[in-house]
């Protein structure tokens, strides 16, 4: 028998991506980071 058409079995879990910039002083530039699910990854 042919299979009935269904979507792929995995489920997509959405996470919020938050970009942030933090000023650390006029002579030190800025730190730019990417936080995924509460963890800074860059």
């Amino acid at each position: 028998d042919a299979e009935f058409r269904h979507d792929s079995g995995y489920e997509v879990h959405h996470q919020k991506l938050v970009f942030f910039a933090e000023d650390v002083g006029s002579n030190k530039g800025a730190i730019i980071g990417l936080m995924v699910g509460g963890v800074v990854i860059a």
Epitope: D1, A2, E3, F4, R5, H6, D7, G9, Y10, E11
Partner: antibody
């Protein structure tokens, strides 16, 4: 809320073509993953799946009836149609349409119409 | 076609009893995507069928927790922990993995 309602001729004669309409509200067949199936039930007997149509106009049929079945849709009017050619008394019963989305958590026939009764008589 | 065999075909119960319905498929109904599309529907007298359980063990919205589904591969079970009057009717198992989609013959849950 989601509702579906079937309509048909009520009575028709052997060898005629049965035309059924499923009119629905609360969802759209333009939504990716959406689909509608037709199911029938001879009086006092069990359920038989007939056909299914997807949002992208892909279709599936019960092979035992495929040569006699045509499923189609009018997305803008929120309607799905089923035609069965060359009806016989064995085609009598209650015909249901049911929603079956494939891109939601509940990939099943989650909402059904009330059914429409079909009699085949000389 | 995938044959769905339900047992028993008739199940007399008293209110408050536990009820168990078995459904066996003639071949595995595990889809290539990993899901098992085994569903249970209840048809009360004079009404349309209603979805109770999907993907073997998931209760549909509004279905009381006295209903539970279990099983894998080809053997599946629907259990009702304490039967209430509103549970009476015909229960159908259904597979949605292979064309044609197929129902079991139904199990009539009725009062003794």
């Amino acid at each position: 809320q989601v509702t579906l309602k079937e309509s048909g001729p009520g009575i028709l004669q052997p060898s005629q073509t049965l035309s059924l309409t499923c009119s629905f509200s609360g969802f759209s067949l333009s939504t990716s993953g959406m689909g509608v199936s037709w199911i029938r039930q001879p009086s006092g007997k069990g359920l038989e799946w007939l056909a299914h149509i997807y949002w992208d106009d892909d279709k599936r049929y019960n092979p035992s009836l495929k040569s006699r079945l045509t499923i189609s849709k009018d997305t803008s009017r929120n309607q799905v149609f089923l035609k069965i050619t060359s009806v016989d008394t064995a085609d009598a019963g209650t015909y249901y349409c049911a929603r079956r989305p494939i891109r939601t958590v509940v990939d099943a026939m989650d909402y059904w119409g009330q059914g429409t009764s079909v009699t085949v008589s000389l | 076609d995938v044959l769905m065999t339900q047992t028993p075909l008739s199940l007399p119960v008293s209110l408050g009893d536990q009820a168990s319905i078995s459904c066996r498929s003639s071949q595995t109904i595990v889809h290539s995507n990993g899901n098992t599309y085994l569903e249970w529907y209840l048809q009360k007298p004079g009404q349309s069928p209603n979805l109770l359980i999907y993907k073997v063990s998931n209760r549909f919205s509004g279905v009381p927790d006295r209903f539970s589904g279990s099983g894998s591969g080809t053997d599946f079970t629907l259990k009702i922990s304490r039967v209430e009057a509103e549970d009476l009717g015909v229960y159908y198992c259904f597979q949605g993995s292979h064309v044609p989609l197929t129902f079991g013959a139904g199990t009539k849950l009725e009062l003794k």
